[in-house]
């Protein structure tokens, strides 16, 4: 995934000289690009830079440890060997990678940015783009998986392991492609007049594309979860007329609403400000986007720290597995048969399915 700095980018429209040859700036310093974008390139560590770095590294370490814990838990507990959990493990892997990418960024930010070459700067950004795309794509895949299971009235999809592997490969291929696009061409190295302010080697057009791509993904997720919620609400209302358990149905609905609100709320809080900022960078010349950039980058990164909490810590079985791993306890049956899998499946599964299947055990 290293930045390709020898070929002339084919995507960005080059600036032409008098001789009608594209003018490219591969050998220029990072300061050259920053000076043209109006973005401050620090010469020394100030309080804000130190604070961002300190907080960033702390968050990184938490992201990597928390997500590693999720992956280990899913690996060791046979009860988690279902498509939803494989996707959650992949989400944890994406978030773990985000932690690594951010760790690399932390040591190449502030005054250290000056030391970077065009290639290493593109690598730095590419790693972040790859990890965040993988994270978002995983969230989308989980939303799709939940949608399929609810509407097919199953606890777990009948998806084969091979198909899950294909989905995971597609997620990572898409993430790597998205991360590599600027390195292999869609940048402003040969189109200096169209560099962005926030990412001085990225084209304005790429920032707009990147922001819209992620916002559209976000809207799709909202629609999917809204559809799930609407369907479950409809089912529970229908069942509450025919059964004597309206309170249970109401509780189930509230629990579903809570989970969906947490999932989408975290996504909105962590992602929307940064994505909107990218659009404002291009569309609002009078907006001082650079003042909020570092804060919103941290916020987006926090999403990788929150995903293990949201998707895993709400699962009693997962919590128990965590305790076993952290306390080095031997589980009674960590790799035993999966007969208890229905009972121990995630509260997210149960939340979504309890209301749907309360009178229909045969489908499970």
């Amino acid at each position: 995934m290293a930045a390709i700095s020898t070929s002339i980018p084919v995507i960005s429209q080059p600036q032409f000289t008098a001789m009608n040859e594209p003018q490219c700036f591969y050998n220029e310093s990072i300061a050259f690009f920053y000076n043209r974008s109006g973005k401050h390139l620090a010469t020394e560590w100030n309080t804000v830079s130190k604070l961002v770095m300190g907080l960033g590294i702390t968050v990184c370490i938490f992201i990597m440890l928390a997500n590693l814990l999720v992956m280990v838990a899913i690996y060791v507990n046979r009860r988690f060997h279902f498509p939803i959990y494989y996707l959650m493990a992949n989400l944890a892997a994406a978030d773990f990678f985000a932690g690594l990418a951010y760790f690399y960024l932390m040591f190449n930010t502030g005054p250290n940015t000056r030391r970077l070459t065009v290639s290493t700067w593109l690598l730095r950004q590419g790693l972040i783009d790859t990890s965040l795309t993988a994270s978002v794509a995983n969230l989308l895949a989980i939303a799709i998986e939940r949608h399929i299971t609810v509407f097919r009235m199953q606890l777990h999809t009948r998806m084969s392991n091979r198909r899950v592997v294909v989905v995971i490969v597609v997620i990572w291929t898409m993430a790597i492609v998205m991360g590599a696009i600027p390195s292999v061409g869609w940048n402003c190295i040969c189109d200096i007049e169209n560099c962005s302010n926030m990412a001085p080697l990225y084209s304005d057009s790429y920032l707009v594309f990147w922001a819209i791509f992620n916002l559209v993904t976000f809207v799709v997720m909202v629609v999917l979860y809204a559809h799930i919620f609407g369907y479950v609400r409809q089912r529970t209302m229908r069942m509450s007329r025919h059964s004597s358990g309206p309170r249970r149905n109401r509780d189930t609905m509230m629990s579903l609403l809570k989970t969906v609100v947490i999932v989408l709320g975290a996504f909105i809080i962590c992602w929307t400000p940064g994505l909107v900022l990218l659009l404002l960078d291009v569309c609002c010349p009078q907006c001082d986007v650079l003042a909020y950039e570092k804060f919103f980058l941290l916020l987006a990164e926090f999403n990788s720290a929150m995903n293990p909490i949201i998707y895993s810590y709400r699962d009693k079985e997962m919590s128990a597995t965590f305790r076993q791993i952290l306390c080095c306890q031997r589980s009674e049956n960590p790799t035993g048969p999966t007969e208890g899998s229905d009972r121990s499946a995630s509260s997210l599964n149960h939340t979504i399915l309890a209301g749907v299947h309360s009178n229909d055990h045969s489908v499970v």
């Epitope: 600036q15 000289t17 008098a18 003018q23 700036f25 300061a31 050259f32 000076n35 043209r36 974008s37 109006g38 973005k39 401050h40 007049e193 560099c195 302010n197 010349p285 009078q286 907006c287 001082d288 650079l290 003042a291």
Partner: antibody, heavy 122, light 107 residues
Framework: QVQLVQSGAEVKKPGASVKVSCKAS????????ISWVRQAPGQGLEWIGE????????YYNEKFKGRATLTADKSTSTAYMELRSLRSDDTAVYFC???????????????WGTGTTVTVSS | DIQMTQSPSSLSASVGDRVTITCRAS??????LAWYQQKPGKAPKLVVY???TLTEGVPSRFSGSGSGTDFTLTISSLQPEDFATYYC?????????FGAGTKLELK
Amino acid sequence: QVQLVQSGAEVKKPGASVKVSCKASGYTFTSYGISWVRQAPGQGLEWIGEIYPRSGNTYYNEKFKGRATLTADKSTSTAYMELRSLRSDDTAVYFCARESISRRLGWNFDVWGTGTTVTVSS
Amino acid sequence: DIQMTQSPSSLSASVGDRVTITCRASENIYSFLAWYQQKPGKAPKLVVYNAKTLTEGVPSRFSGSGSGTDFTLTISSLQPEDFATYYCQHHYGPPLTFGAGTKLELK
């Protein structure tokens, strides 16, 4: 139309400070960088520094670092250049000049201020 | 810092003449060169930027060329209003420097 109107002429004693203002009109002030250039009598042009009001970032000529301070007031669309510890060789016409492109810095200037004559004499 | 060397320092010409002013940078500045015209008691006026791009409203008799370290400003047919001092300036990035100027006088 786009205009940069500067404050009036100043006469200062050596060691004193001067603050020249440059009021912008006819465009979005924060979208364009503002540079300060001076011209001593019968001499060429000398760049002092630039401020990018959108972010407040400043760039200085090493020669003036520590002696010149560039600021911008977004509410009044006014840029300021303060020069401290004045010497007789600071006697010049001081111009503010607007970047030719918006949202980034092209480091060339299509709109110039009216000029402010600063005379340093004991 | 990048040094800008302009030549000649002064030039006498007549209306209708073709004149060329040259500017040399001490290092590669790609096409980041601007030309300004300044009349006595007035502020400079941007004529050309990016070595060859004419500013809006500048007559087509003005043309700029060059790339790297050597640049020229050409006026194909001098008009009375063209007599002024011309300065080159690199716009590669800070710190910005100007040439010493070329005074274009009526012969």
